[in-house]
């Protein structure tokens, strides 16, 4: 015997209590799928949370981070600091990236300059607290004559700056 | 972590009335569908009703006796209970949960519980 419950639309519950009859689901609520039992409590965008998309009877609000933050953990349950470019956030707030490290972005950690001896190749371009290193060729492939730039002096390998 | 306590429960005569209320702690009632269940002696868990922006959802027993109502500002729920009856004798729990009605969920969280006893 089919359950009467399957003939209600996403957007209402079934109601136990009045014969499985479908009544909508109240504002600020919201049913995905048919045949549901309950609706759903609505996600609220409330502080460092904005509404990204309004809740609906079938679906639920989608949240952002306001300026200065962004989204962390799915469907953006948290809100983390942004920093600048060259920093990274900790316990204490924005640092600066120490000596031989770098970050490109507003967020994440600040993580070591390539080593550009490793894949034996030279420092094109010196890192920043904001950049990597760019490597260029190889010493052996700037042979004599080939061209005219004279190598950067390497960069310091990563480390510490003094405090 | 929330708390919910319940209050407003005790002795009242046939036909009477009872205001339960039930404060939340630790976390605003705004974000929940809030309500009640009630236990007699000897008896299963029984729901008695659910309270979601601005709409009440009732048990099937209660006959328009019962009224759940909140205070978002107080962080509180009220359940009114008029003609009380001798079958309405129950420990009366408030509840809250991300789902409404709560007539066929167990709730996120839920109080203590207050005694009340309808007898003359």
């Known amino acids: 015997l089919q359950d009467p419950c399957s003939n209600c639309p996403a957007g209402t519950f079934c109601d136990n209590n009045r014969n499985q009859i479908c009544s909508p689901c109240p504002p600020n609520s919201f049913s995905s799928a048919g045949g549901q039992r309950t609706c759903d409590i609505c996600r609220q965008c409330k502080g460092v949370f904005r509404t990204r998309k309004e809740c609906s009877s079938t679906s639920n609000a989608e949240c952002d981070c306001t300026p200065g933050f962004h989204c962390l953990g799915a469907g953006c349950s948290m809100c983390e600091q942004d920093c600048k470019q060259g920093q990274e956030l900790t316990k204490k707030g924005c640092k600066d990236c120490c000596f031989g490290t770098f970050n490109d972005q507003k967020r994440g950690i600040c993580r070591p300059w390539t080593n550009c001896s490793l894949d034996g190749k030279s420092v094109l371009v010196n890192g920043t607290k904001e950049r990597d290193v760019v490597c260029g060729p190889s010493p052996a492939d700037l042979s004599p004559g080939a061209s005219s730039v004279t190598p950067p002096a390497p960069a310091r390998e990563p480390g510490h700056s003094p405090q | 972590e929330v708390q919910l306590l319940e209050s407003g429960g005790g002795l009242v005569q046939p036909g009477g009335s009872l205001r339960l209320s039930c404060a939340a702690s630790?976390?605003?009632?705004?974000?929940?569908?809030v309500g009640w269940f009630r236990q007699a002696p000897g008896k299963e868990r029984q729901y008695v009703g659910t309270?979601?922006?601005?709409?009440?959802h009732y048990g099937d027993f209660e006959n328009n006796r019962f009224t759940i109502s909140r205070d978002n500002s107080k962080n509180t729920l009220y359940l009114q209970m008029n003609s009380l009856r001798a079958e309405d004798t129950a420990v009366y729990y408030c509840?809250?949960?991300?789902?409404?009605?709560?007539?066929?969920?167990?709730?996120?969280?839920q109080g203590q519980g207050t005694l009340v006893t309808v007898s003359s």
């Open positions: 509840a809250i949960s991300l789902k409404y009605p709560m007539a066929t969920v167990t709730p996120d969280y």
């Open positions: 309270y979601w922006s601005g709409y009440a």
């Open positions: 630790g976390r605003t009632f705004d974000n929940y569908a």
